[in-house]
């Protein structure tokens, strides 16, 4: 199991289980999105594939002063395996492209829910 | 306070060039990643560019990519886009921005006209 305590319930969390909760915060993020999501902040966008959860907080966690996001970030880092701090990016990441924020979780929407669908918690 | 002051916009013919200069104050402009991003009317937000801190790390969007030059001056504040082979399609209100940090932290933007 994924040990993904502190932000959610005491103990380890089931990955079905965190992962529908990321799910949750994101559309959640998404419905009740007024004005532009953190002031329109643009942040790299990534590949979603392998590493996608780390990748994913090595982009939103360069984004401060958005309380929007501030859950997902807590969430998406007991999905990475290692810690990761703001201006720091692995290999994996590839910076190519900036978006804003509000398509970048739209996009990662997207991406969690088919992987729910197809059962990959991991 | 953070204040960022573009310049350089103005109309010019297709195939044209022009710099535009952003003035940073407010913080310590050497340490932070900035962006250019444009809007043309009618349009949503389109990000252009980005140059990390030092100035060595540059990336650019797929549609500027060989014509648009993102550089800095850490010792006079300033980020710069140097913009060649003008196409009316880059007809927009250029901001410079700290990046990350939304519209907080942007410009009020220079206008780029490109027209014949």
């Known amino acids: 199991l994924t040990c993904l305590g502190g932000f959610a319930s005491p103990g380890p969390v089931p990955p079905s289980t965190a992962l529908r909760e990321l799910i949750e915060e994101l559309v959640n993020i998404t419905q009740n999105q007024k004005a532009p999501l953190c002031n329109g902040s643009m942040v790299w966008s990534i590949n979603l594939t392998a590493g996608m959860y780390c990748a994913a907080l090595e982009s939103l966690i360069n984004v401060s002063g958005c309380s929007a996001i501030e859950k997902t970030q807590r969430m998406l880092s007991g999905f990475c395996p290692h810690k990761v701090s703001a201006g720091q990016f692995s290999s994996l990441h590839v910076r190519d492209t900036k978006i804003e924020v509000a398509q970048f979780v739209k996009d990662l929407l997207l991406h969690l829910k088919k992987l729910f669908r197809e059962g990959q918690f991991n | 306070e953070v204040q960022l002051l573009e310049s350089g916009g103005g109309l010019v013919q297709p195939g044209g060039s022009l710099r535009l200069s952003c003035a940073a104050s407010?913080?310590?402009?050497?340490?932070?990643?900035m962006d250019w991003i444009r809007q043309a009317p009618g349009k949503g937000l389109e990000w252009v560019s980005s140059?990390?801190?030092?100035?060595?790390?540059?990336r650019y969007a797929d549609s500027v990519k060989g014509r648009f030059t993102i550089s800095r001056d850490n010792s006079k504040n300033t980020l710069y886009l140097q913009m060649n082979s003008l196409r009316a399609e880059d007809t927009a209100v250029y901001y410079c921005?700290?990046?990350?940090?939304?519209?907080?932290?942007w410009g009020q933007g220079t206008l780029v006209t490109v027209s014949s």
């Open positions: 921005a700290k990046a990350y940090t939304g519209f907080r932290y």
């Open positions: 407010g913080f310590t402009f050497r340490d932070y990643e």
């Open positions: 140059i990390g801190p030092s100035g060595s790390f540059t």
